[in-house]
Interface confidence: low
């Protein structure tokens, strides 16, 4: 039959070449002479020449060492023709098979290998992987399969057998107990892979394992008892700085401290937070201490990590003696912010109200007053009763000065302590109305035709509130009403004008008493511009020379 | 003597934010208000508004309104202005200035700080 | 919003001149008008408070003026040293707002 069973050469072969591997037989050579030639990848197409045929024989030539880690497997056809160039049989696959030898070395993927592990880990912990590789056969020989092994550790402490690996993975795992990062906190260990499963070529690498931190080691006060002095009073100010050792990671959370007021400020006077870089504990006051409250404060500090401690460790206490300075402290006026109704317009020298502060300091301190911020200028304070009284006259309509009825003056307080301290209070004036004002028209000039004339309706503004204000009365005085006619709509917050009588084109004077509900009387002068035209009109048409 | 100091130059990228300061000394920081004032490059000067370190009361400039943020600290004597998506428009010396009692305008001046806005 | 215009946006002067910068207001101030000084290094200084009043240490040389909308700042004997820009201010109504500015030169 026309076929052939796979060939397997091994590789590297020594030789004699060409070397005769297998003849390939047509049983079509009984009837004619047959020729025998083969194609494919390393006979007629790259690699060219590795196999070839002898024409007659049919003799499958192999000219040169095959390399199985190069090309492990080549697939050749063979033709057979008659000799007139026709083909007498099928093309024929033939298979060749290139059989490994060990000839490479296991090769580390890297020459040195990084792991870490937390210290204190149980054994059997999972470190790193390792990996080797070996170019030979792995799957029909051992020529390619690796065995690794640890063949030294550095340092040897607390024993040389820290670390076992996989013989056949090349896991690193912790074998014994006793990682100890504060002790040692890197090991190097030598490994080794091995082919043949061990019994043949070897090759060595590093693996460095780095013990990383656990927070393992408490922080410790040094010095454990601490006396700081403090003014009273003082918000924010920097008690003392409390100093920790701690043996983990600096940096680290088991390293970074977190301090806890355990007792002693009861009153909520202070406030610890850790420096950043230097791991103290900075006690601070929250509020102000007063000393005439309490004199001398005993706080227990307890210092902890930011990362919880990994077994059960003692905690180390630190004892602050916190003694309060006495400070000479600002009066305060009570209320700090006083209201007072008071009527605007009362008489100069008329007392608005008493404001005084109180002295927080024990001695019997002697208080002034006066007067700190009074935009208008209204008051007058008396420096020993705290008496306010009015100087100006106080009016409510005063819009620099006056917000929605209040005026606020800002008094101040001071003590004969050394050095002599202030406080300040504010006094808001509510001012209550009085009608001081009448009503007023606007506009106060208009512009109006002498034949068919437009009313006139001018808006009544009264600066007072009510009931001082609407509704209005108009009367018209000085012979105004001769010409003119003035009346109040029945809202009684607008005045209506009208000319009753023609005028010549010229500028008049009406004269125009406007009084509000409480009989304030206003008398304005309006402006009139009567113009020759009919209707409406806002300036006189035509040249002009009136007045 | 009444000293108003102000904070260093700022250089910074459009639609971000800054916070400039005025430290005050030499008098009762409460007992005074304490305002802003805008100087654009060449330009005049723009009141921003005020704050009464005393009662915290602030008032604006409708303009500046939602732009400029003012507060203090009295425990450190010390007013802020804080001015937020910034522009280009916004690059000026900004001023802070006590307001004297009574009529007596904007009595004492801090030295500016330049604000540069750009990307 | 009340605006305030100083006409004379530069004005050179020679050392002891009499020198006077004026401002108006687009509406009644009633002397609510304030006047400062700001030197070629930023520096701004207040001279003249509610309309005529001199700021405590501000020589005797510059004095204050006006009523209704129109005011003036005078320099009786101009020196070195007043060489600046010089703004108005208006404290009558908010929003508080200043004049342009006149630079005072030297010839």
């Known amino acids: 039959d026309w076929v052939v069973a796979p060939i397997s050469v091994p590789e590297n072969g020594k030789g004699p070449f060409p070397q005769r591997l297998n003849q390939l037989k047509s049983n079509k050579d009984r009837d004619t002479k047959i020729f025998y030639s083969i194609t494919g990848p390393g006979a007629d197409s790259p690699p060219e020449g590795v196999f070839a045929v002898e024409k007659e024989t049919g003799w499958l030539l192999l000219n040169k060492p095959l390399d199985r880690e190069e090309i492990a497997k080549y697939e050749l056809f063979g033709h057979a023709v008659s000799e007139n160039g026709a083909s007498v049989e099928d093309p024929m696959n033939i298979s060749i098979i290139v059989t490994d030898q060990n000839d490479h070395k296991p090769k580390f993927t890297q020459d040195t290998f990084r792991g870490s592990v937390l210290e204190g880990v149980l054994p059997g912990t999972s470190v790193m992987q390792v990996t080797a590789t070996d170019e030979d056969d792995a799957i029909y020989t051992y020529n390619g399969v690796v065995a690794y092994s640890i063949h030294s550790q550095e340092p040897k402490d607390p024993h040389d057998l820290m670390f076992t690996i996989h013989r056949s993975t090349g896991t690193i795992s912790v074998i014994s107990s006793g990682l100890d990062r504060e002790k040692v906190p890197e090991y190097t260990l030598t490994i080794q892979a091995t082919d043949m499963d061990g019994d043949g070529s070897t090759t060595t690498a590093v693996a460095v394992v780095e013990i990383l931190d656990a927070n393992d080691n408490a922080p410790m006060f040094d010095p454990q008892k601490y006396e700081a002095h403090v003014p009273e009073n003082a918000v924010g100010h920097e008690v003392q700085r409390l100093t920790v050792t701690d043996l983990d990671a600096p940096n680290s959370p088991a390293w970074r401290a977190t301090y806890l007021i355990m007792g002693g400020d009861d009153g909520d006077h202070f406030t610890i937070t850790t420096h950043p870089e230097s791991n103290q504990g900075i006690l601070t006051t929250r509020k102000g201490l007063d000393f005439e409250a309490k004199n001398q404060h005993t706080l227990y500090v307890e210092v902890t990590n930011e990362a919880p401690f990994v077994l059960k460790l003692p905690t180390s206490t630190a004892t602050i003696v916190v003694h309060v300075e006495d400070v000479n402290e600002a009066p305060v006026f009570v209320p700090p912010s006083k209201v007072v109704e008071v009527q605007e317009g009362i008489p100069t020298g008329e007392p608005v109200c008493v404001y005084t502060a109180e002295d927080p300091d024990k001695e019997n301190q002697k208080i002034s007053y006066r007067i700190l911020r009074d935009p208008a200028g209204w008051l007058a304070m008396d420096p020993d009763s705290g008496q306010v009284t009015a100087v100006g006259t106080l009016d409510r309509e005063d819009e620099q000065f006056v917000r929605n009825n209040i005026y606020e003056v800002m008094v101040l307080a001071m003590d004969n302590g050394s050095p002599p301290t202030t406080g300040t209070g504010t006094l808001l004036l509510t001012l209550i109305d009085v009608n001081d004002h009448g009503p007023v028209p606007e506009p106060r000039q208009i512009t109006i035709c002498n034949q068919s004339p437009v009313r006139q309706v001018l808006n009544i503004t009264d600066k007072d509130l009510s009931p001082h204000t609407s509704p209005f009365q108009a009367q018209l005085t000085d012979d105004s009403d001769i010409y003119w006619t003035a009346e109040v709509n029945e809202e009684g917050d607008t005045v209506v004008l009208s000319l009753k009588k023609f005028l010549k084109q010229d500028t008049y004077d009406v004269h125009l008493s406007l009084s509000d509900h409480g009989n304030k009387e206003q008398l304005t002068v309006i402006r009139a511009t009567v113009c020759d035209c009919h209707g409406h009109v806002e300036t006189c048409p035509g040249p002009w020379k009136g007045g | 003597q009444v000293q108003l100091q102000e904070s260093g130059p700022e250089l910074v990228k459009p639609g971000a934010s800054v916070k400039m300061s005025c430290k005050a000394s030499?008098?009762?920081?409460?007992?005074?208000?304490m305002h802003w004032v805008k100087q654009s490059h060449g330009k005049s000067l723009e009141w921003i508004g005020f704050i009464d370190p005393y009662s915290g009361i602030i008032t604006y400039n409708q303009t500046f309104k939602g732009k400029a943020t003012l507060t203090v600290d009295k425990s450190s004597s010390t007013a802020y202005m804080q001015l937020n998506s910034l522009t280009s428009e916004d690059s000026a010396v900004y001023y802070c200035?006590?307001?004297?009692?009574?009529?007596?305008?904007?009595?004492?001046w801090g030295q500016g700080t330049t604000l540069t806005v750009s990307s | 919003d009340i605006q305030m215009t100083q006409t004379t946006s530069s004005l050179s002067a020679s050392l002891g001149d009499r020198v006077t910068i004026s401002c108006r207001a687009s509406?009644?101030?009633?002397?609510?008008l304030n006047w400062y000084q700001q030197k070629p290094d930023g520096t701004v200084k207040l001279l003249i408070y509610?309309?005529?009043r001199l700021h405590s240490g501000v020589p005797s040389r510059f004095s204050g003026s006006g009523s209704g909308t129109d005011y003036s700042l005078t320099i009786s004997n101009l020196e070195q040293e007043d060489i600046a820009t010089y703004f108005c201010?208006?404290?009558?109504?908010?929003?508080?707002?200043f004049g342009g500015g006149t630079k005072l030169e030297i010839k």
């Open positions: 201010q208006q404290d009558s109504k908010h929003p508080r707002t």
């Open positions: 509610y309309t005529s």
């Open positions: 030499g008098y009762s920081f409460t007992a005074y208000n």
């Open positions: 200035a006590r307001r004297g009692y009574y009529d007596g305008g904007f009595d004492y």
């Open positions: 509406q009644d101030i009633t002397n609510y």
